[in-house]
Each structure stands twice: as C-alpha cells, then as structure tokens.
C-alpha cells in the first residue's frame, strides 16, 4: 500500500486512478469502512465521517479518470488507511500526519534552550533531523533539544521527519533575542566624544522593556549605574542618568549613547542589560572604553592608555618622519628629553593602529 505523509494544519491530496480516462463511480472510505466521499450521478456526495466538512475532490480531473480526495486542515487523528473503490478495485493509501512545534515561545533569549516536539500518530516510529540557519544539524526522536541558543540560531529551522522512507519537511522560525555583538571596544583620545551603539540582532513589531548601563571604571573600586531607560514600542525614554558623566541617549532604536568626552576616569567596561516585557532573563552587551592621553611635562614626553587593553597591544611613541621610536606592551611609554617635532602616540594590534594621538614638542632653548 502507498504511504503518504502529511503536516498538521496542511492540506493533502490522496490520488486514485481508474484505468479508463472517463467519469465513473468512486468512493473513498476509511479503515472502518465509513464512507467519506464519492460520486453520485455527476455530483460529489459526502458520507457520515468526521472528515466530511474537510474533505473534497478535484472535480476537474474526474473525466480524466482521476478521483482524488483532498483533506484540508489536517489533524494527527486523520492518520489512517484510506480506501478508494473504483472500477471494482480497491486502492489503499496510508496517511500519516505529523506535527512539529516549539514547546515554548519561538522568541527566545540567547542562552535559553529550545525544545521541538513531534506529534505523531500511534504506532509510527519517525526520526527527525533539524538544521539550524547556521548549518548546525541535530537529530532526535519525539523531541529535539537545543540547550543553549546562540545568535546564529536565529532564523528558519528546517526539520525533516522521516517514516517508511518518506519525508515531510517543517519550517520553524526561531528568533534569538540578542544584541548583534556580545562585546565591543571604543578607542578614543582624551577629550574626544564617545558614541556607543547597541544594535539588536532581531526586529519585533512591538518592543517593550527596560534597560540599564552599569559601568566599571578602571580607576573606581566599584561599578556604577550610568543610565536607566525604558523602551516602549521601540521608543526610548531615559529614566535616570548619572550627573558625571552626563550621557545623552537617542529616543529611537538602535540604542545609542553619547558621552561628551573621553576622560581617563571614564575608561573601563560597561554592561548594558535589556529586560524585555514578558520574557524571563535579560539581553547583555559588554562595551569597553579605552582612552589615550599624550602629555609633555618638563623633559618627559608620556603616552598613556586607560581601560581594558589586551596584553598583546603595543603602545609606541614615534617622532614623525624620523626613526626614533619607543614601543612597549604596556599601558604607558615615555621619552626623556624628546627631540623637537611632532610625536605620535600609537596603540596598535599586530600592526593595525587602533588609536593615535599627536603631540608637538617645541624646542627648549
């Protein structure tokens, strides 16, 4: 007998063909021999089955000797063996209806787990294979679990259910609620304006919640809340902002903050958290601020950086157009009795300049 797999909520068409291409008597029955539909004269008639309001036939193909049964809005309990009686012969078709759903909301925070549950008819033994948008393959039986969702898991998951060498494909849209970046670092010279941006990795029609930026300055013993804000339907309103520094925040997404000037006392790390309405847990993004200062005091030319820098970063003092250079994998470099001219202080990572500050040394007579 023929096996057909269907998807819960979908429509399936079971086919039955007569040997002659002409309109003739036919009946579709279920395994209990209850008539579902058939032909009487030129008209479609329906029997007393539970399917009667969801069953139909493609009448346009009757005169081609094709007597299909279409079942709409499939249910798991529609799984059965259906019998087509035509020209004194019987054709059996086994219909197996499967459903695949996410156990929880399909909008999940990064780090949360996703469980997909397969609904299947009794007696079936299907296997499920799911592929994430990022190409991750997961296999399972009645349930499939993804323990810790990552940003790249956002998008359409394609799941294939296999039974009796037949397959049916499900597509489930999963939205991982996260910031686009887990961490970002801003490099600034002292006195420059600082802009922090926190773009989200998803879009929602209605986005409501509240957030806060906590800041741990390198020079401070404890962290401090710099700003708290509300988000209502994608509109940002500031609730409380510290007096020092006096941050400004944009009223539109993406979340955007400006610091009037980069100062050594602000250098450090921040953690922006966003709690979304009706969601447990918070979205996080780390942001770092590195500040550079180049100064000349008496016979000493110094370049310093504050903030979270990796040990592999190099700090250099270099006289423009000359070979004179002093470099260190440290947070401060200095030159005693520097030559007159334009000196450059450079913070670099494997040759790539991250931050540069120029200071003019005037000759001392």
């Amino acid at each position: 007998k023929k096996v057909v797999l269907g998807k819960k909520g979908d429509t399936v068409e079971l086919t039955c063909n007569a040997s002659q291409k002409k309109n003739t008597q036919f009946h579709w029955k279920n395994s209990n021999q209850i008539k579902i539909l058939g032909i009487q004269g030129l008209f479609l008639t329906k029997g007393p089955s539970k399917l009667s309001d969801r069953a139909d036939s493609r009448k346009s193909l009757w005169d081609q000797g094709c007597f299909s049964m279409i079942i709409k809005n499939l249910k798991i309990e529609d799984s059965d063996t259906y019998i087509c009686e035509v020209e004194n012969k019987k054709e059996e078709v086994e219909l197996l209806v499967f459903g695949l759903t996410a156990n929880s909301d399909t909008h999940l925070l990064e780090g949360q787990s996703l469980t997909l549950t397969l609904e299947s008819p009794p007696g079936s033994s299907p296997s499920v294979k799911c592929r994430s948008p990022g190409g991750k393959n997961i296999q399972g039986g009645r349930t499939i679990s993804v323990p810790q969702l990552e940003r790249q898991d956002s998008g359409t998951w394609t799941c294939t259910v296999s039974q009796d060498q037949k397959t049916v494909e499900f597509k489930i849209d999963i939205v991982v609620l996260a910031f686009q970046k887990a961490s970002s670092t801003v490099y600034k010279k002292e006195g420059e304006q600082v802009e922090f941006s926190f773009p989200l990795a998803f879009t929602l029609e209605k986005l409501t919640g509240s957030g806060e930026l906590w800041w741990q300055a390198e020079r401070a013993s404890s962290s401090k809340s710099w700003i708290t804000f509300d988000l209502k339907n994608k509109e940002v309103s500031v609730k409380r902002v510290t007096q020092d520094p006096k941050l400004q925040m944009g009223k539109k997404l993406p979340l955007h903050l400006t610091l009037p000037q980069a100062l050594p006392q602000y250098a450090g790390s921040g953690n922006l958290t966003l709690a979304l309405e009706a969601k447990t847990g918070k979205l996080h993004q780390e942001v770092n601020l590195v500040v550079m200062r180049a100064t000349q005091f008496q016979e000493n030319l110094t370049c310093e950086v504050w903030g979270p820098t990796s040990p592999k970063l190099t700090l250099s003092l270099k006289l423009e157009n000359k070979g004179a250079t002093v470099s260190k994998q440290a947070k401060a470099v200095w030159v005693l009795n520097p030559e007159a001219g334009m000196w450059q202080c450079l913070l670099s990572d494997s040759g790539q300049v991250l931050l540069e500050s120029n200071i003019k040394v005037v000759p001392t007579w």
């Epitope: 304006q193 509109e235 400004q248 925040m249 944009g250 009223k251 539109k252 955007h256 400006t258």
Partner: antibody, heavy 117, light 107 residues
Framework: EVQLVESGGGLVQPGGSLRLSCAAS????????MTWVRQAPGKGLEWVAN????????YYVDSVKGRFTISRDNAKNSLYLQMNSLRAEDTAVYYC??????????WGQGTMVTVSS | AIQMTQSPSSLSASVGDRVTITCRAS??????LNWYQQKPGKAPKLLIY???SLQSGVPSRFSGSGSGTDFTLTISSLQAEDFATYYC?????????FGQGTKLEIK
C-alpha cells in the same frame, strides 16, 4: 486631506492663562506622537512640548516646564496646550505638529499668542 | 542638552546656483536630523528626514547628507521658489532642538 488647525490664540496679560487647541483630520490621530512648536516674531523655531499616542509620556522644553501642560483627547482628534503664568517671552506663533517618529512632518497654519500689558 | 549650530545665518545666491547649508551637533546624533523650509507667514515644510531621506513631494534638487555631528543640506540648482529660511532639527532625543536658521536671499 491630512490637516491640523490651531485655535485659541489671542492677547493675554503677563501672568494670565490661555488654552490652545488643535483639531486633526485626515489621519489616525491616536497613532501619532503630537508636538507644539513656537516661533517668536522675527525669530527661529523652538520646540515646546511632545505627547505620546496615549498621553502617557510628555516632554517639555525647560523654559515652559511647570507652566505649560500638553494634553490630548483621541476621541475628539484634538491636541491641547494649557499655558499658565504667561510671560512676554512666550509671545509667538504656536504650531501644532504631527511627530511621525522620524520627523515632524505635518504642520498646522499656527495661532498667534501675544503676552502684553 | 545637545546644541545645534547652523551656518551661515544668511546667504545670497542666484537662480541656478548650488547652495550648501550646514548644521553641527555638539554631540553625536547618528542620523536623527531633519531639514525644513519656511517662507514668510507660512508654516515650515519638511524637506529631508533621517539626514538624507527626501520627503515625498519634495523636488530632487534638495538633498541631505551627514551623520554623527556634521550635516549638510544641498540645493543643486536654485529655483526662484527656493528663496526662504531653512532650519535643521535634531530629533535624536528630548529636548528637540532647531538650528538658528539660514535665510537664503536673492543676490
């Protein structure tokens, strides 16, 4: 046609009060933030106040805080500005404006408020 | 509050000229800036929103550019009806702030 029509302007003595109204038509009023902007004679534009769709959030320029109140009646498609303790420097044309979220896009013709003894 | 500095305050030009007006924010405001045109006795009219998007119905000779702190309104070829006062508006956060205005006059 999308339209905003202001009314309620006039001459008032310093310390007096006035209530400006704005009738909106041609768009779904309850879906937009609304704004008042003013312009003193011969001067530039000054944003005065904003109100959210449901009236739950209101913002004011510092110079009018505590004296002016912005409000709305979505059932009547109307925006209001209650102005108390008026000063000579409040003399201006007051415009009712629709805030499209990314711009102040539709402006009324304005109503003149003169504060003078 | 973030300050907006518009320049020049006045400008003389002729029909057919290319004209540029600038607006500078005291702090970064992304692209949250609009440009308006106002003629005497009339309400302002929106020309450009989100720094560079042309408002529907506005002639393509008007264009906007910039982001962060520096913004520009350009009229590629002045027409007689373009002589008016132009204002920039920061709608990055509250309070909204207008520039001081640029009066564009016929030379």
């Amino acid at each position: 046609e999308v339209q905003l029509v202001e009314s309620g302007g006039g001459l008032v003595q310093p310390g007096g009060s006035l209530r400006l109204s704005c009738a909106a038509s041609g768009f779904t009023f309850s879906s937009y933030w609304m704004t008042w902007v003013r312009q003193a004679p011969g001067k530039g534009l000054e944003w005065v106040a904003n109100i959210k769709q449901d009236g739950s959030e209101k913002y004011y320029v510092d110079s009018v805080k505590g004296r002016f109140t912005i409000s709305r009646d979505n059932a009547k498609n109307s925006l209001y500005l209650q102005m108390n303790s008026l000063r000579a420097e409040d003399t201006a044309v007051y415009y009712c404006v629709r805030d499209r979220y990314d711009a102040l896009d539709i402006w009324g013709q304005g109503t003149m408020v003169t504060v003078s003894s | 509050a973030i300050q907006m500095t518009q320049s020049p305050s006045s400008l003389s030009a002729s029909v057919g000229d290319r004209v540029t007006i600038t607006c500078r924010a005291s702090q970064g405001i992304r692209n949250d800036l609009n440009w308006y045109q106002q003629k005497p006795g009339k309400a302002p009219k929106l020309l450009i929103y989100a720094a560079s998007s042309l408002q529907s119905g506005v002639p393509s000779r008007f264009s906007g550019s910039g982001s962060g702190t520096d913004f520009t309104l350009t009229i590629s070829s002045l027409q007689a009806e373009d002589f008016a006062t132009y204002y920039c508006l920061k709608d990055y956060n509250y309070p909204y702030t207008f520039g001081q205005g640029t009066k564009l006059e016929i030379k």
